[in-house]
Structures are given as C-alpha cells and as structure tokens.
C-alpha cells in the first residue's frame, strides 16, 4: 500500500472512529433496564452519561439529567472525563492530520514536517481510542459491579414490610452506546496505528543518495582497470550493483558469468 493511501485510509478510519466516540458519549443508551412490569404496562429505563430516561409501553417517555443528583457513582465522573479527553485528543488529531496529509499541499511544507505531523496525529488518535475503550470498559464494569452489589443486598429490613425499603431485582443489559464506544475506540486506535505506519514512509531516506555498498561473493576480490569487479568462483551468484544516473536506483540479483578478467 502506498504511503498516501495508508495515510489517507488511516485518517478516514480515525475520523469514523472519532465520530463514533462522540456519538457514544452523547447517547442515552449506555445501559438499559426493566424498571417495572405488570400485565398492562412495562417501564423500561435507559441511562447515559448525562441523563436517564424512562419509556413506558404506552409510549410515554421522560428524560432527566443528573445535574442535581448526589451520590452518583464516582466512576461515572471518571468515564465522562475519559470520553471527553478522547474527544479533545481526537479533535486535535484531526486538525493536525489534515495539515499532515500528503495529498494536501500547504505552503512549502516538506515531507519531514508532514512525517512529524502524521506521527503526532497518529499518537493522538491512538490515545483517543484507548481513552474511549477504557471509558466504556470502566462503565461496563461499574454496571456489573453495582448490580451484583445491589442484588446481594436485595432485602434490607423485614423483606419490605411497612416503612422499609426493598431493592427490586430487575433485568439489565449493556446499552448500544457501549458497543458503539468499543467499536469506535478500536477504529480510532487502528486509524492512529495506520497514521504512524504512514509516517515511516513519509520520512525522507537519504541513505540512497549518500553511499552504495559493493558486495562480492568470493574471498579474493581484484579490481581491474575499467571498474569491473572480479571474483573467484565460476558461475557463482554475485550481487552486482550498478549505479545509474538516477542515483537512487540499484539493480540487484543479477547472475554473473566468468569473463576474461576473472582469475581461474
């Protein structure tokens, strides 16, 4: 794959992943739950990072933000922070990578500068993807832990007799946002890796212009006037490197045959 294609594909994959991270962060369906059920109506609950919604089988839906709520899990704040950091790094990564794209010419920016910017954006995308994956995984773990804990302490106080509180065991599932977040984080990470790989191809390799090494297959090497290389061994496979005007091109793996200059 060409450097431009690798860089471009990495950018597109990261962009899709980044959009997914934003979508996941904004989505309300991080977890879903049955809150209430009877033969007539059912109340479903879906919760996001910012608000919780109830939807009834009758069609009634109501969402409420967490602003005034005390006692939210501390891990929720950590997940929010991780997702926001992921988005911020993604934004910076996109801005940097736009200028780094080989197919876009900006002023007199040379390949060395573009390579550095490509590497920078790649690293930013990798960290952004990791933040999203960790954030979503922490939330999933928090969900499982909290539900296990509250189920273990299901009855507190006389099994729910008068004046007491009883924890209700309900079915819960991971919401769509978790899967969106995992996939998006993975795509951003992959895109970032591709950008880093593309950076290696963008780095100008000056070694081709500085020196060309000569190798002979035999031990005794003699040079005759005229610049020909002589070696021992008839019909042995020597690696002749002939320098052309281009300076950077070499010709490898040619079969050498005995000539009048070879020693026998």
């Amino acid at each position: 794959m060409s450097v431009t294609a690798c860089q471009g594909l990495g950018f597109v994959v990261s962009l899709i992943g980044f959009a997914g991270i934003i979508a996941a962060t904004c989505m309300d369906q991080w977890s879903t739950q049955d809150l209430y059920n009877n033969p007539v109506t059912a109340v479903f609950n879906y919760q996001g990072l910012w608000r919780s919604c109830v939807r009834e089988s009758s069609g009634f839906t109501e969402c409420r933000g967490y602003f005034t709520l005390l006692g939210l899990p501390a891990m929720l704040q950590a997940v929010r922070a991780l997702m926001i950091v992921g988005i911020v790094l993604g934004v910076i990564g996109i801005l940097v990578s736009i200028f780094a794209l080989k197919c876009i010419r900006i002023g007199s920016m040379d390949d060395s500068a573009k390579a550095k910017m490509t590497l920078t954006s790649g690293i930013l995308f990798i960290i952004s993807g990791i933040c999203a994956i960790i954030g979503v995984s922490v939330f999933a773990n928090m969900l499982v832990t909290n539900f296990w804990m509250s189920t273990a302490n299901m009855y507190s106080g006389m099994g729910g007799m008068g004046g007491m509180v009883q924890t209700v065991q309900t079915r819960y599932t991971f919401g769509a946002a978790l899967f969106v977040g995992w996939v998006a984080g993975g795509l951003t990470l992959i895109g970032g890796v591709m950008m880093c790989i593309a950076c290696r191809g963008l780095t100008p390799d000056d070694s081709n212009f500085k020196a060309v090494s000569y190798h002979a297959s035999g031990q005794n090497v003699a040079y005759r006037p005229g610049g020909f290389k002589a070696s021992t061994g008839f019909g042995s496979n020597t690696r002749n490197k002939k320098i052309y005007d281009g300076g950077a091109r070499t010709e490898d793996d040619e079969q050498s045959h005995p000539t009048k200059y070879d020693y026998v």
Partner: nanobody
C-alpha cells in the same frame, strides 16, 4: 432516603366510599410507579392498583370497576378512590413507591399502612 406517608383510612359502612392518599418525600432521583397493596389478617399482601409515571394504570380483578387510582407527579402523591366497599375489603392498605436509582437496581419504598375497616 424516601419517606412514604399514607392517610385516609378509617371505618366505613358497606357500600360506602373512601379516598386514600399517599405522599412520597425525601431525596430521590425519580419515582417510576406508585401503587396500593393490601393485607388482610392471616393472608398475604396483594396488589390493589398501581399507576406509572406516564399515567398507565393497573387494577387487581377484585377492585376493577370499584376503584380509581390517580397521581400528582408534581407533588409525588398517589390517590386511591374506592367505591362500593365490601366487608372483604377490610385490610391494612400499604402504599408502594418504586424509585429509580441510576446505575443500580430500583428501590421499593413502603409506607407503614393505613387501616380500612368495612363494617356495619
């Protein structure tokens, strides 16, 4: 913590009417549903009627057509209007409040109960 307080119980003659009230107070995220249960001496607690936040109602067969449940979301209060009362309706009536707890299982809060006696 959520406090649940019932009121409106008392002695009523057969065929009479009674209106029970239940108010929830305290700090909580959101009430999902409120309802009334009753427990007669020597028997298990049974559902009378429930109402969800959206206003969907459910009545036990024993009270269908004879009772109406309503609620005031702003006041976190639920009402049970019972008509054509029979002696078998005699029981302690408990108010139930189901509260949503974000990222946890929901909690059911119960009142201490109000006595309803149907007797001539």
């Amino acid at each position: 913590e959520v406090q649940v307080q019932e009121s409106g119980g008392g002695l009523v003659q057969p065929g009479g009417s009674l209106r029970l009230s239940c108010a929830a107070s305290g700090s909580f995220f959101r009430i999902v549903a409120m309802g009334w249960y009753r427990q007669a001496p020597g028997s298990q607690r049974e559902l009378v009627a429930t109402i969800t936040r959206g206003g969907s109602t459910y009545y036990a067969d024993s009270m269908k057509g004879r009772s109406t449940i309503s609620r005031d979301n702003a006041k976190n209060t639920v009402y049970l209007q019972m008509n054509s009362l029979k002696p078998e309706d005699t029981a302690v009536y408990y108010c139930n409040v189901r509260v949503e707890v974000p990222f946890m299982q929901p909690n059911d809060y119960w009142g201490h109960g109000t006595q309803v006696t149907v007797s001539s």
